[in-house]
Amino acid sequence: VPPGEDSKDVAAPHRQPLTSSERIDKQIRYILDGISALRKETCNKSNMCESSKEALAENNLNLPKMAEKDGCFQSGFNEETCLVKIITGLLEFEVYLEYLQNRFESSEEQARAVQMSTKVLIQFLQKKAKNLDAITTPDPTTNASLLTKLQAQNQWLQDMTTHLILRSFKEFLQSSLRALRQM
């Protein structure tokens, strides 16, 4: 049962409708719940989760990461710059989420749900951004060749890649969640 999920027969009390910000907050936490389930399966299947951060860092994946210049941290926070970074980062993660689609057995449904709900989140955040021109969309041809390259790796590297994607995506979403709460 994912965190925050009640397994009883829940007849919900009548509450105020959720605001746009509350929905975004819950959406990110929902995706994080999905990532948790996927990480659990990955860790049960391989010993990647015990690998040291240093060893994992030596990879050639160009996974999105928050940096000081992105304006998402408390020091030097910039709402517009940060929102552009969040959207751009999520768009860049899409190819990696596509890669994850055939990497799970018992959590295949969750992998699909993480992908779908991320797409919905991107579309929702895009309407919040005033500076849409600053958002760079990844090149489909480059993404297609990256996907082919990742899928051609040996089993150990594929396990490593899966673990890295999940860990990086989790960290990126957690940073995004903190930043969006300040907006």
Epitope: V1, K8, V10, K26, Y30, M116, V120, F124
Partner: antibody, heavy 122, light 110 residues
């Protein structure tokens, strides 16, 4: 195989009550938002209610607010719709659907049951 | 009265391209993502397009969706006889705090 199976439909008099059930299988039920959508004979689709991945949050169509209650039992992988004060205009096939989009915009209903017929007539 | 307006019918010959429009307002299509559903005669609806232009796995790439402002459209290229069905657009409506469906468009393959 991912499946949703509705039950509990039937003939009921105006003012009466009915409880619909939807048994889910083949997926992690507690991870998904769920919804009820209905279709009156020869008419289009009408969303009735949604319950989000954390069961404490629900949304209802104005036409059923105060009369219908959506709920879920994650230990039984089952979704419910308690329908009270039924009217002739509630006559429809009631579909149970899974919401794959999460918390934004009601999600996208990616898995549907085959539906159960509810007839409200004296 | 549906909040989303669709033409009641559309038709084309096999191989043709058919486009279905869906018009809404700032509180639904203008603010939220659009989904499209296909309902074949006597069956339950099926998700065809989600999040404006995304196809779930298993949906042929003959189907495509787009959105601009408060309108959306579904295009079926290379129309086939099995595409004969009712098509519904849908979106969340912030004013109603609910999910709204279009009235549906019946597609006939001539």
């Amino acid at each position: 195989e991912v499946q949703l199976l509705e039950s509990g439909g039937g003939l009921v008099q105006p003012g009466g009550s009915l409880r619909l059930s939807c048994a889910a299988s083949g997926f992690t039920f507690s991870f998904y938002g769920m919804a009820w959508v209905r279709q009156a004979p020869g008419k289009g689709l009408e969303w009735v209610s949604s319950i989000y991945p954390s069961g404490g949050y629900t949304d209802y169509a104005d036409s059923v607010k105060g009369r219908f209650t959506i709920s879920r039992d994650n230990s039984k992988n089952t979704l419910y719709l308690q329908m009270n004060s039924l009217r002739a205009e509630d006559t429809a096939v009631y579909y149970c659907a899974r919401s794959a989009g999460g918390w934004i915009g009601g999600g996208a209903f990616d898995i549907w049951g085959q539906g159960t017929m509810v007839t409200v007539s004296s | 009265q549906s909040e989303l307006t669709q033409p009641p019918s559309a038709s084309g010959t096999p191989g043709q391209r058919v486009t279905i429009s869906c018009s809404g307002s700032s509180s639904n299509i203008g603010s939220n993502t659009v989904n499209w559903y296909q309902q074949l005669p006597g069956t339950a609806p099926k998700l065809l397009i989600y999040s404006n232009n995304q196809r779930p796995s298993g949906v042929p790439d003959r189907f495509s969706g787009s959105k601009s402002g408060t309108s959306a459209s579904l295009a079926i290229s290379g129309l086939q006889s099995e595409d004969e069905a009712d098509y519904y657009c849908a979106a969340w409506d912030d004013s109603l705090n609910g999910y709204v469906f279009g009235i549906g468009t019946k597609v006939t393959v001539l």
